[in-house]
């Protein structure tokens, strides 16, 4: 007798969510800063929140948080929010550090 | 310009306590402080951080054994180490408002 194959799919919120942050976590004033919300989800995130460390929601919805110039206002610690039509999932804190550039410091 | 003067460090058997602290010369502690580590051939990593309402973020590798804290009254920033391990060796950098200090060395012995 012939058999069927069956393929299950299993739907979930999304999960191991993190931030990455490029080009790395201490950038320089000035520069770009590019934030990025991974996560494992299924279905895919369908909308992404960014929150800073007191909790206070960002204007910012898209997988990417990008901060161009970056400035030392921006440093503190950040994390995100995916959700999908299962349910939602967050990430741990990650830190991002905005330093003087040396011509600055020699200004000031 | 902002002075940044770090105190504390040395060396210390694994296992052990030591703080490190930083004053700030003017009065910015407005953004985040904190404490970053280099170790021989490894990068700058972030340690602890804080804002000026009192927002922790630690690296996993000092989450349950440091902890920060800040005065800002007196424009201090400081972190307690405690279970001190040899990787725990570093230059420690004081950070405060885009400003990092000159460093200090802990040295922690086996």
């Known amino acids: 007798t012939a058999s069927k194959a069956w393929t299950l799919e299993v739907l979930y919120a999304p999960r191991r969510l993190r931030v990455s942050m490029s080009p790395g976590d201490q950038v320089m004033e000035g520069k770009s800063a590019t934030l990025t919300c991974e996560s494992d989800a299924n279905p895919p995130v369908s909308h992404y929140t960014w929150f800073d460390w007191n909790n206070q929601s960002l204007p910012y919805h898209s997988q990417k948080l990008r901060l161009e110039p970056v400035k030392v206002q921006h440093s503190g610690a950040y994390w995100c929010q995916g959700t999908n039509s299962v349910g939602k999932g967050r990430s741990p804190l990650s830190t991002l550090t905005v330093y003087y550039s040396p011509e600055t410091i020699g200004r000031r | 310009q902002v002075q940044l003067v770090e105190s504390g460090g040395g060396l210390v058997q694994a296992g052990g306590s030591l703080s490190v602290s930083c004053t700030a010369s003017?009065?910015?502690?407005?953004?985040?402080m904190g404490w970053f580590r280099q170790a021989p051939g490894k990068q700058r990593e972030m340690v602890a951080v804080i804002n000026s309402a009192g927002s922790t973020n630690y690296a996993d590798s000092a989450e349950g054994r440091f902890t920060i804290s800040r005065d800002l009254a007196k424009k201090t920033v400081s972190l307690q180490m405690n279970s001190l391990k040899p990787e725990d060796t570093a230059v420690y950098y004081c950070?405060?408002?885009?400003?990092f200090g000159q460093g200090t060395q802990v040295t922690v012995s086996s």
């Open positions: 950070y405060v408002d885009g400003y």
């Open positions: 003017e009065s910015t502690f407005s953004i985040m």
